[in-house]
């Protein structure tokens, strides 16, 4: 499975979109986890709503938010107020019982803010809606460590 590299600015939001086959993953919850080491376990950060029909609702754990458009086959994860400690390898997962299928591997890189926090007090952040459909678009730079994006499953 290819690894997608996403770069975000410290203090900003980084949005990750993982696409999947909506029919194949019908009825399955999704999760975002952080890989502990190259071969280590993937530690759950946040997962979608426990009721699959409500997966479009945003679920939050700390500064990480997840929402799933189950009909379109896109799960969106937003890392808010990105910090240097957020850098690392993550996975989008599709959950089936106790098993987790990796949808996408994502390497998050955090870039230092060139403004160095100047004028940070003047930044305006629009109020967000509760559901996926109203999610604001976050900006990020991405590249792929291997070939195509999104990776084929």
């Amino acid at each position: 499975l290819n690894t997608t590299v996403l770069q975000g600015m410290a203090g900003q939001s980084l949005r990750v979109s993982c696409t999947y086959d909506a029919l194949k993953h019908w009825g399955r919850r999704k999760a975002w986890c952080r890989q502990l080491g190259e071969e280590g376990p993937c530690q759950r950060v946040v997962s979608t709503h426990g009721v699959w029909l409500l997966a479009f609702l945003k679920k939050r754990n700390g500064s990480t938010v997840i929402a799933d458009d189950t009909l379109a086959g896109t799960v969106t994860i937003t890392l808010k107020n990105l910090q240097a400690g957020d850098a690392g390898l993550y996975q989008c997962q599709s959950l089936r019982g106790r098993e987790a299928e990796v949808l996408q591997k994502v390497l998050v890189e955090v870039l230092e803010d060139p403004l160095d926090d100047q004028d940070a007090g003047d930044l305006w952040v629009p109020e967000e809606s509760s559901s996926f459909e109203g999610a604001q678009v976050e900006h990020s730079t991405s590249r792929n460590q291997e070939t195509s994006f999104p990776p084929t499953s």
């Epitope: 019908w26 426990g50 029909l53 479009f56 559901s131």
Partner: antibody, heavy 126, light 106 residues
């Protein structure tokens, strides 16, 4: 007029089955999630389960206490939602309501229920 | 599972009074909360959705606020037709209802 009408309630012995119907009119039935709730005599409201709209291919979700015993289904051609109740227990005695999930203007839905039926009484007793 | 604690369980107020009902969730539920009115022998009626949005056709004297764990439902000026039981309902987990608040006229 947007309307939901439940039917099929009555007295049933423990362990037996009963099927409730919820007939919809005045709206495009297939576009909405339909839910069942219940209210035991003198008690509060309890969510039983719901069934997704046509887009969700009738996917169902249930509260833990009825999972494996109750089944929700829908017939789009007749605009009817059903609640099949098997292995009934005395604690299932309640007024059962069907309700429609609210749709946002942009097409998404919210689990707030904006149209309700009048309710049908189910009594489980020997 | 999330527990919804509604208070008070009952209250008595005069016509024209401001009435406030609170609903507390056992954990953060964002703004995933609705409020319903149920009159004796009748089905519930949706008043407020997403914690603060007034349902179409509902009088503006009804309002809702709050986020996280603490939510408030307010009737700005109580009317005789507002005699009912009011319920909050969360949808952050499995659509749990509060125990209800019975509102009566003094």
């Amino acid at each position: 007029e947007v309307q939901l009408v439940e039917s099929g309630g009555g007295l049933v012995q423990p362990g037996r089955s009963l099927r409730l119907s919820c007939t919809a009119s005045g709206f495009t039935f297939g576009e909405y999630t339909m839910s069942w709730f219940r209210q035991a005599p003198g008690k509060g409201l309890e969510w039983v389960g719901f069934i997704g709209s046509k887009a969700y291919a009738g996917t169902t979700e249930y509260t833990a206490s009825v999972k494996g015993r109750f089944t929700i289904s829908r017939d789009g051609s007749k605009s009817i939602a059903y609640l099949q109740m098997n292995s009934l227990k005395t604690e299932d005695t309640a007024v059962y309501y069907c309700a429609r999930g609210k749709r946002y203007s942009y097409g998404g839905w919210v689990p707030a229920f904006d149209v309700w039926g009048q309710g049908t009484m189910v009594t489980v007793s020997s | 599972d999330i527990q919804m604690t509604q208070s008070p369980s009952s209250l008595s107020a005069s016509v024209g009074d401001r009435v406030t009902i609170t609903c507390q969730a056992s954990q953060d539920i964002t703004n995933y909360l609705n409020w319903y009115q149920q009159k004796p022998g009748k089905a519930p009626k949706l008043l407020i959705y997403d914690a603060s949005n007034l349902e179409t056709g509902v009088p503006s004297r009804f309002s809702g606020s709050g986020s996280g764990t603490d939510f408030t439902f307010t009737i700005s000026s109580l009317q005789p037709e507002d005699i009912a039981t009011y319920y909050c309902q969360e949808y952050d987990s499995y659509l749990a209802f509060g125990g209800g608040t019975k509102v009566e006229i003094k």
